[in-house]
């Protein structure tokens, strides 16, 4: 099985124990590590951070001791903006220039492939996204002709039904991608006005339609029915939780909220907590399991957080094995307890290790 793990370059800027550099990663933990994110400037793939080249080097030296490890560079992301991607993909010349710039950049910096993180193509970009993938793959095939190992091509796709329907021609893009990471998280957010788990495995009894589509099982099944081969589908598992501030004394699933949860000490983003911050939060919190959805949530005071733990990730891995998927994807290594100092287990990357162990289990 593949274990595809994202590392985010901005995690270097977190304070103190939250700061994560690629040299803190375990070279034997994942089969693929994806560095997020690269930029596109003047239609050419480019660095984003001032020290990306140094960090690329740090990441790719992990392969010295584990030659089986593959590294990919992810281009795009939330801050890149869908419109910018759209402009490049919809213009033949810009698209060509971008595609041509990729292989030399990846080879120069020691990456084994490219991950496309266009978040997200609009309904009018659907065809252009397909063309971008098809032409990128053709370029990778051509570039590998002189006996080089062919560069890998993957894409991170939304698990939201509306985005799947409007943005992706699943059957066509699947033909050209080496694997697809389906982002089976962020199904629920503060915009709903109520508490809810952002990455349920199954639809819960609490989920009235239209929430019937907001779960991992539906998204994976739908992708498969749309023509994604199970052998290319990698299922996303979050090492972060989504938090809410409760608006009343109700604390269950579907309880009213006044907004996102308070920012974490390190990640400093309202409504999001890294797993290592959740381990802190759990001291003195009340933990519940949403039985139908097979995921936990915890409450403390007026704070509510839905997250994944070692038990829920094992359920998810068993599910993806039952579905005969290609493996699991983790967003993100730097949100797991990468130092092993927060979750009291004397184990670095406890969630990712639980995923790895479950994948390896017979």
């Amino acid at each position: 099985y593949k274990l595809v793990c994202y590392y985010t370059s901005w995690s270097q800027y977190r304070e103190g124990d939250g700061s994560c550099f690629p040299d803190a990663l375990d070279r034997f933990l994942c089969t693929h590590i994806i560095y997020s994110f690269a930029n596109i400037s003047n239609d050419h793939i480019d660095t984003w951070e001032w020290n990306d080249v140094t960090l690329y080097g740090m990441l790719n030296t992990l392969k010295n001791r584990n030659p089986n490890l593959k590294t990919l560079l992810s281009v795009g992301g939330w801050n890149f903006g869908s419109q910018r991607f759209s402009k490049i993909a919809s213009n033949t010349q810009s698209r060509r220039t971008f595609i041509k710039s990729v292989p030399p950049f990846l080879r120069t910096h020691g990456f084994d492939g490219l991950d496309l993180a266009w978040l997200y193509p609009g309904r009018r970009d659907k065809q252009h996204f397909t063309t971008l993938i098809k032409e990128m793959k053709a370029e990778f095939i051509k570039e590998a002709q002189p006996g080089k190992k062919q560069l890998l091509l993957s894409a991170a796709l939304s698990a939201g039904k509306v985005t799947i329907d409007s943005s992706y021609d699943i059957a066509k893009i699947s033909q050209h991608l080496d694997f697809i990471s389906i982002m089976t998280y962020d199904f629920h957010g503060a915009w709903r006005g109520t508490t809810g788990h952002h990455s349920p495995l199954f639809r819960g009894q609490e989920d009235a339609s239209p929430d019937r589509f907001s779960n991992t099982d539906y998204a994976v099944g739908y992708m498969l029915r749309l023509g994604a081969p199970a052998s290319k589908l990698v299922m996303g598992i979050p090492t972060f939780g989504r938090s809410f501030t409760l608006a009343s004394s109700e604390t269950g699933v579907g309880a009213p909220i006044s907004g996102p949860g308070i920012p974490g000490r390190f990640t400093k983003e309202a409504g999001t907590l890294a797993y290592y911050e959740i381990c802190d939060f759990l001291r003195g919190a009340t933990v519940h399991r949403i039985l139908g959805q097979q995921v936990p949530y915890a409450t403390k005071g007026n704070q509510w957080v839905g997250y994944d733990d070692q038990e829920s990730v094992k359920s998810k891995v068993q599910y993806l094995k039952d579905r005969q998927l290609a493996g699991a994807m983790v967003w993100a290594l730097d949100l797991d307890d990468f130092q092993g100092s927060f979750c009291g287990q004397d184990l670095r990357f406890p969630l990712t290790n639980a995923i790895k162990d479950a994948l390896a289990a017979t």
């Epitope: 609009g122 309904r123 009018r124 509306v162 985005t163 329907d165 409007s166 009235a208 339609s209 239209p210 019937r212 739908y222 029915r225 749309l226």
Partner: antibody, heavy 122, light 108 residues
Framework: EVQLVQSGAGVKKPGATVKISCKVS????????MHWVQQAPGKGLEWMGL????????IYAEKFQGRVTITADTSTDTAYMELSSLRSEDTAVYYC???????????????WGQGTLVTVSS | SYELTQPPSVSVSPGQTASITCSGD??????ASWYQQKPGQSPVLVIY???KRPSGVPERFSGSTSGNTATLTISGTQAMDEAAYYC??????????FGGGTQLTVLG
């Protein structure tokens, strides 16, 4: 206020071609797909096809493929549906319909024209 | 042949609850929408995304979906609700498809 105003009723001979217009107001014409729906007398609704006014791209239902042409004129904010090789079973009310631009994926139609009756008779 | 199957007619007494069903394999994967059409008028959207009601549609109209069956429920049915009702869904293979329609008759 969103309005879709269609051209008037008409009688056509078998084998002829009919072209119906649908003029929109109250929203940006290029923001959303324009669909056409057929309703034969006493029968149900049947989706015929759509045009994306932004780029003129069309999708047609298999049943009407080859006989229907849907176009959009952005200079007048008007969509057109042309149906050729008319036969008696094409006698129907034809509606233009669109979905609100608030939705990224147009699963449904929340604005409809008043309908245009086309009678095919020799 | 319709991808979405509706009963041709449903009768209800005023003040009672009317339920109109729509079944089809695509509904397990797709949102259901419902339209009301009165004689000589254009269809009007009454439910979209399974359960959502456009502004201006009375609260007595509600929708639900379970498995491959969508249901339009009209509670406290009034004489003015007498009309034809059509379910509709989108699917990657069939594009936009309508059910055959159900004529709702309000007795009395």
């Amino acid at each position: 206020e969103v309005q879709l105003v269609q051209s008037g009723a008409g009688v056509k001979k078998p084998g002829a071609t009919v072209k119906i217009s649908c003029k929109v107001s109250g929203y940006t014409f290029t923001d959303y797909y324009m669909h056409w729906v057929q309703q034969a007398p006493g029968k149900g609704l049947e989706w015929m096809g759509l045009v994306d006014p932004e780029d003129g791209e069309t999708i047609y239902a298999e049943k009407f493929q080859g006989r229907v042409t849907i176009t959009a004129d952005t200079s007048t904010d008007t969509a057109y549906m042309e149906l050729s090789s008319l036969r008696s079973e094409d006698t129907a009310v034809y509606y233009c319909a669109t979905a609100s631009p608030r939705e990224e994926m147009p699963y449904y139609f929340d604005y409809w024209g008043q309908g245009t009756l086309v009678t095919v008779s020799s | 042949s319709y991808e979405l199957t509706q009963p041709p007619s449903v009768s209800v007494s005023p003040g009672q609850t009317a339920s109109i069903t729509c079944s089809g394999d695509i509904l397990a994967d797709q949102y259901a929408s419902w339209y009301q059409q009165k004689p000589g008028q254009s269809p009007v959207l009454v439910i979209y995304h399974d359960t959502k009601r456009p502004s201006g549609v009375p609260e007595r109209f509600s929708g639900s979906t379970s498995g491959n069956t969508a249901t339009l429920t009209i509670s406290g049915t009034q004489a003015m609700d007498e009309a034809a009702y059509y379910c509709q869904a989108w699917d990657i293979n069939t594009a936009w498809v309508f059910g055959g329609g159900t004529q709702l008759t309000v007795l009395g």
